[in-house]
């Protein structure tokens, strides 16, 4: 049309002396906020801070006490088949997805979804509900470990013998059990071990049931307070403090685990324990429960669907190659789980040999392993006090960094909702103190005499595999089918300089959702109401409370969809289209000018949006 004129203009341009354009407006740095906005988002001071924080966050108690037991229970080496299917099909893809969307959007666990797909920002809320509940009960384990640690500083471990005030006439020391024939004769009488009695009668002072909460255990309440204080001071300065604390908390447990591994492997009976741990039984793979265990273990052990990994990723520099590090961290995490099995089962093998019983009789999972089986094992070793102190310090450090990384994730997610309010002055620190205090007060219900029942209720329902699978499904669905896997790959390429192989993209689109739906359905089909110690049956009201805890997170997704659609006006399809479109995409923006006020609402492409706090915070 006007090619001639256009070419003439270009010729004139080339003839002229070419000068740089001066420009006038004050720019804003990539990470800076415009004047009057919240302070700029801090970043990890070095790559190692991030790597160690993630390592500390997901290498936790589950690696040591859950994976080895699941391996033994579900067919030994054969369990590695479903484990690796879930690892590569959902664990690593979701783990990387959470890190990368945090890094990409520079937002925490809620607001990142607000940016990616406002209609599904309930994913973020669901994650925060799960992590908030998790933070209340996970730390109770650390309170128990602290109590055991203090009790270990004695010449004689208090769970080694039966001569204590808390012991019953039925208490029988393990030296008696070495004689198998004597043990068989007397085992018809209900004899208990001093370790079990210490755990149930001293530590827990276990009441008859959840409807008998009893009194507060002040010693445990103080231990809980202590670990909450440590947790608070580890995160109160944000990633500046978290990033430095993990240098110790994330590395020291590995050294201790190595020491325990060497100790275990040099004990008599270790070989039998390891054989028991890994001997493959392929027939077990026919049981859906094995697959459910593999799936849920992956989700637990990678600390995904909690918003924590997204929050950690959000402090990365935009150009940081997190793909490479996520893969290495995955190897570290699963490797730690695998190696822990050797450390645990070598000691269980020794213990079984010492007692003259089958390994199946001593193999435990969860608190049973940490507070019954292992403490019992150390009483049979030379230098029991030393090994006990070492074990409980390792347990504490393993759990502590997982705890404070998850609290950091929770805090980041919430602070990012109200940045202009919560990032000013000391408000963030005050807010952290508030969250920690509330969580501590809720945790006190778990350090009463009936506290163990409350703890198990939270453990079984609040952060159950079902909740995590639900969140993971929606995360992958939104990224693959609404935001678009290719679009995210464009962003990843912009950040790390290349596109990862298609494996991730296909996992988000098909493999992970299929695995999640399958696992979710089987979990519901195979659901059995919670019991304690396979004997105590929870009352219906407690089961109802448990399901309320589970649904409190899961319902966030549909609930937010309904709320968002109600907040937006206009034709239904226009509303849906608008809410499926990414928001606030440019974190380098200096201003937001295009929103036109209309009837005290905002007009956006035919959709009227009522100004709620979320829309105001993330869009204006």
């Amino acid at each position: 049309m006007a090619t001639k004129e256009k070419l003439q203009c270009l010729k004139d341009f080339h003839k002229d002396i070419l000068k740089p354009s001066p420009g006038k407006s004050p720019g804003t740095r990539p990470e800076d906020e415009a004047e009057g906005k919240p302070p700029q988002r801090e970043k990890w001071s070095s790559k190692i801070d991030f790597v160690l924080s993630v390592a500390g966050g997901f290498v936790g108690l589950g690696n040591v006490w859950r994976f080895p037991y699941l391996c033994y229970k579900n067919g030994g080496g054969a369990f590695l088949i479903p484990y690796f299917i879930f690892l590569f099909g959902s664990g690593l893809p979701v783990f990387f997805l959470e890190i990368i969307i945090g890094q990409y959007t520079s937002e925490g666990g809620i607001t990142c979804w607000e940016k990616i797909c406002p209609l599904f920002s309930g994913i973020g809320y669901a994650s925060v509900v799960i992590v908030s509940l998790l933070n209340v009960y996970y730390i109770v384990i650390l309170a128990w470990a602290t109590y055991y640690l203090f009790q270990s500083f004695q010449k004689e471990l208090p769970w080694a013998h039966c001569n204590h005030s808390w012991n019953t006439p039925h208490c029988m020391e393990d030296t008696m059990r070495k004689n198998k024939s004597v043990w068989i004769t007397i085992s018809s009488t209900n004899f208990t071990s001093p370790v079990i009695e210490f755990w149930e009668r001293n530590v827990l002072s276990l009441s008859p049931g959840i409807d008998h909460p009893g009194s507060l255990k002040w010693d445990l309440a103080l231990c809980l307070l202590l670990v909450w204080l440590v947790c608070f001071f580890c995160i109160w300065k944000g990633v500046r403090s978290t990033g430095k604390v993990v240098y110790f908390t994330a590395t020291f447990p590995f050294a201790m685990l190595l020491v325990l591994l060497v100790r275990g492997l040099t004990l008599p009976g270790a070989g039998a324990g390891i054989k028991f741990y890994l001997y493959p039984d392929i027939t077990r793979l026919e049981d859906p429960q094995v697959w459910i265990d593999a799936g849920t273990q992956i989700f637990f052990s990678y600390a995904i669907c909690l918003g924590a990994m997204t929050s950690l990723g959000s402090y990365n520099k935009y150009k940081y190659n997190s793909y490479r590090d996520c893969m290495l961290l995955g190897c570290l995490n699963s490797g730690t789980s695998f190696v822990s099995g050797f450390a645990i089962f070598s000691i269980l093998g020794f213990m079984a040999q010492e007692q003259g019983v089958d390994i199946a009789d001593v193999a435990e999972s969860g608190p049973g392993l940490a507070f019954i089986a292992y403490p019992k094992a150390v009483t049979m070793m030379p230098l029991p006090t030393f090994w006990s102190i070492l074990f409980f310090i390792m347990l504490l450090l393993l759990g502590l960094d997982s705890q404070f990384v998850e609290v950091e994730g929770q805090i980041t997610s919430l602070v990012d909702l109200y940045p202009s309010f919560l990032r000013k002055g000391y408000r963030r620190e005050i807010f952290i103190a508030f969250v920690c205090s509330i969580s501590y007060l809720l945790g006190l219900t778990m350090v009463t005499e009936g506290g163990m029942y409350v703890f198990q209720l939270f453990d079984y329902y609040a952060a159950s595999g079902v909740c995590l699978l639900w969140v993971a499904f929606f995360e992958c669905f939104v990224i693959a089918w609404i935001y678009g896997g290719d679009n995210l790959y464009d962003g990843i390429e912009d950040m790390i300089g290349y596109r990862p192989g298609p494996w991730m993209k296909y996992s988000w689109a098909v493999i992970t959702p299929v695995l999640c739906v399958g696992c979710f359905i089987f979990s519901l089909v195979k659901y059995v109401p919670l019991t304690y110690n396979k004997t105590y049956v929870y009352p219906n009201w407690a089961i109802g409370l448990g399901w309320s805890l589970a649904l409190s997170s899961m319902l966030c997704v549909p609930l937010v969809i309904v709320i968002r659609l109600c907040q937006t006006e206009g034709p239904f399809l226009v509303r849906v289209k608008y809410l499926l479109t990414p928001r606030e995409p440019n974190r380098w923006a200096v201003e937001r000018e295009g929103a036109t006020p209309y009837n005290s609402r905002t007009v956006m492409n035919g959709a009227l949006v009522k100004p709620t706090h979320i829309i105001v915070e993330t869009m204006m």
Partner: antibody, heavy 122, light 107 residues
Framework: QVQLQQPGAEFVKPGTSVKLSCKAS?????RYWINWVKLRPGQGLEW???????????NYNEKFKSKATLTVDTFSSTAYMQLSSLASEDSGLYYC???????????????WGQGTLVTVSA | DIQMTQTTSSLSASLGDRVTINCRAS??????LNWYQQKPDGTVKLLIY???RLHSRVPSRFSGSGSGTDYSLTISNLEQEDIATYFC?????????FGGGTKLEIK
Amino acid sequence: QVQLQQPGAEFVKPGTSVKLSCKASGYNFTRYWINWVKLRPGQGLEWIGNIYPATNGINYNEKFKSKATLTVDTFSSTAYMQLSSLASEDSGLYYCARCKTMLSRCAWFPYWGQGTLVTVSA
Amino acid sequence: DIQMTQTTSSLSASLGDRVTINCRASQDISNYLNWYQQKPDGTVKLLIYDTSRLHSRVPSRFSGSGSGTDYSLTISNLEQEDIATYFCQQGNMLPWTFGGGTKLEIK
């Protein structure tokens, strides 16, 4: 494939205004920032501003704040830039350009329109 | 604003030559430097982004380097189709700013 179509030329009188269009195709229009860039002989390229069609989020270069107004029509997948109170120094070639990625940075432009030549003359 | 300076406004080279075009920023731009090619017919093409990353379908004879405030675009083996004007642009701080351009001609 991604295409940004601009009219070839606009002839306008000083003191009036002109509305330049940029019709997008081959992608989801609402999800990507549209940038406007001016080429003027002797001045090189100058970034005017950008707009995010989904929310009408806008960034302006302070220099062009009172000169340019960016808008979009999501239904026709068209971005517009209105230039007001035109003077001879507003003559030049105006390009629209699209960013590569949807979220985060919008600092480089792989997709460009052909440009509209604006001539301000009495 | 960050000022971008391309000291050479025009450059003559022979086909097959190795050509380097320089660009200087008024402050550190953390490698957020992009290069564009504007053909005589007005079409603009992205060549390199983030200092050294080659945009898709850009011939490998184009390469970018630099850090801090000094950056350069190199054409290793000049071809006829490379006759154009080359602009640098910083993507570190709003508003994005461009260099004045370097016009490349055949000797």
